[in-house]
């Protein structure tokens, strides 16, 4: 089953042959932080090859990163967040391609999670909270926010909201009634690092009241 | 165990579209490349499109280039084709699995897509 179909293979040229990306995670386990990094091509035939990093560390030169299934990995406390790393691919002692990373630059948060709504009857709104692992966090504590939310029918429509807290209001004239809600939402940082959209947290559902109707709070379904 | 199931299939005339959904559990997918694979009655199993880990790198087929688009949610395990202008040609049993298969990988139930008018 290896290989493509006779038609040809996969040729998308906007792909090196060696290029990857990573992104860094900062004290995603006690103190220590984490790199990942991964080859862009799925093609890419990855059983000799190898990562390492080197420069911007605290105390060695370089790290060599753990293969992972198809990724490559390294938790540590040695990186020094100041100043650029060189990340290279290599195979045997030779570097095959390598990229000057700050890796301040490239981070992932963590998901969200205790995503929850409660319905406000006197208020007539939606009160949606979250939590968040980087409040304890030294390093990056100031995330922005993105909650999306769609009625479950509607496939592709999602409304997104951007906000720097973990606390939203949705007013219950902006929903339709008597309808089922799914809600997500994810976060990247917004002060001084730099990166990317952490996954979405688990989805949260709930139903809207119908129209004249008192139901109280909104239970997750 | 490694489950992978796959959904979304149908009949559809030419030109319709369809969006495959594939759930995967029993293994870490956020470390996989990815594919879609496809077999018609009567042919081998080929190969479609192949995503990169992260979902920043794609691999298509000649044949699906430019009407099919792969993606992933590594928050959820699922992989996902999204399959435009179909044609009769594209009437097959479609497949999610890894991209470098082991010898011990099971396959899914797969999911039929039939284009016809």
């Known amino acids: 089953e290896s290989g493509y179909a006779q038609n040809g293979d996969l040729e998308d040229a906007e792909l090196d042959d060696y290029s990857f990306s990573c992104y860094s995670q900062l004290e995603v386990n006690g103190s220590q932080h984490s790199l990942t990094c991964a080859f862009e091509d799925p093609d890419v035939n990855i059983t000799n090859l190898e990562f390492e990093i080197c420069g911007a560390l605290v105390e060695v030169k370089c790290l060599n990163f753990r293969k992972l299934q198809e990724i490559y990995f390294i938790e540590t406390k040695k990186f020094l967040l100041i100043g650029k790393s060189n990340i290279c691919v290599k195979v045997g002692e030779k570097s095959l391609t390598c990229k000057k990373i700050d890796l301040t630059t490239i981070v992932k948060p963590e998901a969200p999670f205790d995503l929850s709504v409660v319905y406000r009857e006197g208020a007539n709104d939606f009160v949606v909270t979250f939590n968040t692992s980087h409040l304890q966090k030294k390093y990056v504590k100031v995330l922005m926010h993105d909650v999306a939310y769609r009625q479950e029918k509607d496939e592709n429509k999602w409304t997104h909201v951007n906000l720097s807290s973990t606390k939203l209001t949705l007013l219950q004239r902006k929903l339709q009634p008597a309808a089922m809600y799914e809600i997500k939402v994810r976060s990247i940082p917004d002060h001084y690092f730099k990166g990317f959209w952490s996954e979405w947290s688990p989805s949260y559902y709930f139903r809207t009241p119908e129209i004249n109707n008192s139901s109280g709070e909104m239970d997750p379904i | 165990q490694v489950q992978l199931v796959e959904s979304g299939g149908g009949l559809v005339q030419p030109g319709g579209s369809l969006r495959l959904s594939c759930a995967a559990s029993?293994?870490?997918?956020?470390?996989?490349?990815m594919s879609w694979y496809r077999q018609a009655p009567g042919k081998e199993r080929e190969l479609v499109a192949s995503?990169?880990?992260?979902?920043?790198?794609?691999r298509y087929a000649d044949s699906v280039k430019g009407r099919f688009t792969i993606s992933r949610d590594n928050a959820r395990n699922q992989l996902y084709l999204q399959m435009n202008t179909l044609k009769p040609e594209d009437t097959a049993v479609y497949y999610c699995?890894?991209?470098?298969?082991?010898?011990?990988?099971?396959w899914g139930q797969g999911t039929q897509v039939t284009v016809s008018s």
């Open positions: 029993g293994f870490t997918f956020s470390q996989r490349i």
């Open positions: 699995n890894k991209r470098n298969l082991e010898i011990s990988d099971d």
């Open positions: 995503i990169s880990p992260f979902g920043d790198g794609t």
